[in-house]
């Protein structure tokens, strides 16, 4: 949904949260095209590319919350994403640069769809909170209490190492979509129910 | 009533340095991103940097990234801009803005009236 | 970067008539089905203000005869009945991605 409109239709929202999961929990549309732009796809290279411990909750911990927390969780996280994405952003080969080197371009629009699509999930959460009446969550296009501050590598002028920080990054949040596709899965049929 | 106030413009040498202040009130700063935005005499508008809610992230415009640093103090409802290595072409009004709208896609919603920084020998 | 071309530089508009401004993004600005496209009014002296945010969405406050529309790469913005204190120079501004750019701006003045 766009700009904050909300379906009211349970299922309908559900199915969409799932397929958003789903999408985005596919390394071919991220962190693959970061592999190749970064130069990063050599076999010795992507040894060094594990997601960093605690840079995002467990499927476990996500599981534990129940919906309400599961919400607010998953909302607050996806708003550090967006900034890290951003950042990543920043710090990519321009497209004139990539296609002096061969690089290809499709790779590079991949990677700035990634923040559109989690503002689109991020909606879309924002929609369901609304609709099992949790209303303690910010409006998407409201200010909130502060979006709660990430365990951020420290700023480095290594760009090697920014390169491999994007890169661990990028694998811990295909992990996390991958968890949060399936806490949506256990969801029930209707708002009120749930399957275990 | 919501209000931004810059100060610290001023003259200053080629390769010289300025502190830029903008201090908030009527509203709770710490809830958002907040940007600089200046504007060359009789010129348009130029995004310069922007800081997330709570400090942690920085974005630049490529030829001020290295020489400016933005940062806040949520505490004194403050927003800084370190300027150094100053170019003529930083001569501009320097505007702070609040950033509100989708995270990272923000737009301005409110400005303090800016202050005058001139670059020149 | 994303280049911003606003069209026309200025425009003579008669006392309530409409007043169209365009702007054109060097590549879209629109995604997920979102807007990322705004609009700005600056009188002389003053600080810029918001009319229009997400291409069409007006801000609180500003009267009704200011709109905006587009998506893509193509943005208008519309006065309907133009007033004396719409005589301003107007900017649009891209937020799609980093930097954000703006306009170069059009000049209103009444004919």
């Known amino acids: 949904a766009a700009m904050g409109s909300c379906s009211k239709e349970y299922r309908m929202l559900l199915g969409q949260l799932q397929k958003q999961t789903d999408l985005m929990q596919d390394t071919s549309r991220l962190l693959d095209p970061y592999i190749r732009i970064q130069g990063l796809d050599i076999p010795k290279l992507r040894e060094h590319c594990r997601e960093s411990p605690g840079a995002f909750p467990s499927e476990e911990t996500l599981r534990g919350l129940g919906r309400r927390g599961f919400l607010q969780t998953l909302n607050a996280t996806l708003g550090r994403v967006l900034h890290r994405l951003a950042d990543l952003e920043q710090h990519l080969p321009k497209a004139q640069d990539l296609e002096r080197s061969g690089l290809n371009i499709e790779d590079l629009e991949k990677l700035q769809m990634a923040r559109p699509n989690v503002l689109g999930l991020r909606n879309n959460v924002y929609c369901m909170a609304q609709l099992l009446d949790n209303s303690d969550m910010t409006e998407p296009t409201k200010a909130g209490r502060g979006t709660p501050q990430p365990p951020t590598p420290t700023p480095t002028s290594d760009v090697f190492q920014r390169k491999l920080e994007g890169c661990s990054f990028l694998r811990g949040y295909h992990r996390f979509m991958h968890s949060v596709g399936r806490v949506f899965s256990k969801w029930g049929e209707s708002p009120n129910r749930s399957r275990r | 009533e919501v209000q931004l106030v810059e100060s610290g413009g001023g003259l200053v040498q080629p390769g010289g340095s300025l502190r830029l202040s903008c201090a908030a009130s009527?509203?709770?700063?710490?809830?958002?991103?907040m940007s600089w935005v200046r504007q060359a005499p009789g010129k348009g508008l130029e995004w310069v940097a922007t800081?997330?809610?709570?400090?942690?992230?920085?974005y630049y415009l490529d030829n001020v990234r290295g020489r400016f640093t933005i940062s806040r103090d949520n505490a004194k409802n403050s927003l800084y801009l370190q300027m150094n290595s100053l170019r003529a072409e930083d001569t501009a009004v320097y505007y702070c803005?609040?950033?509100?709208?989708?995270?990272?896609?923000?737009?301005?919603?409110?400005w303090g009236r800016g202050t005058l920084v001139t670059v020149s020998s | 970067d994303i280049v911003m071309t606003q069209s026309p530089d200025s425009l003579a508009v008669s006392l309530g008539e409409r007043a169209t401004i365009n702007c054109r993004a060097s590549k879209s600005v629109s995604a997920a089905g979102y807007n990322f496209m705004h609009w700005y009014q600056q009188k002389p002296g003053q600080p810029p203000k918001v009319l229009i945010y997400y291409a069409s969405n007006l801000e609180s406050g500003v009267p009704d005869r200011f709109s905006g529309s587009g998506s893509g790469t193509d943005f208008t913005l519309t006065i309907s009945s133009l007033q004396a204190e719409d005589v301003a120079v107007y900017y649009c501004l891209h937020s799609r991605e980093f930097p954000f750019t703006f306009g170069g701006g059009t000049k209103v003045e009444i004919k």
């Open positions: 803005a609040r950033d509100v709208g989708h995270t990272t896609f923000w737009y301005f919603d409110v």
């Open positions: 800081i997330s809610d709570g400090g942690s992230f920085t």
């Open positions: 009527g509203f709770t700063f710490s809830s958002y991103a």
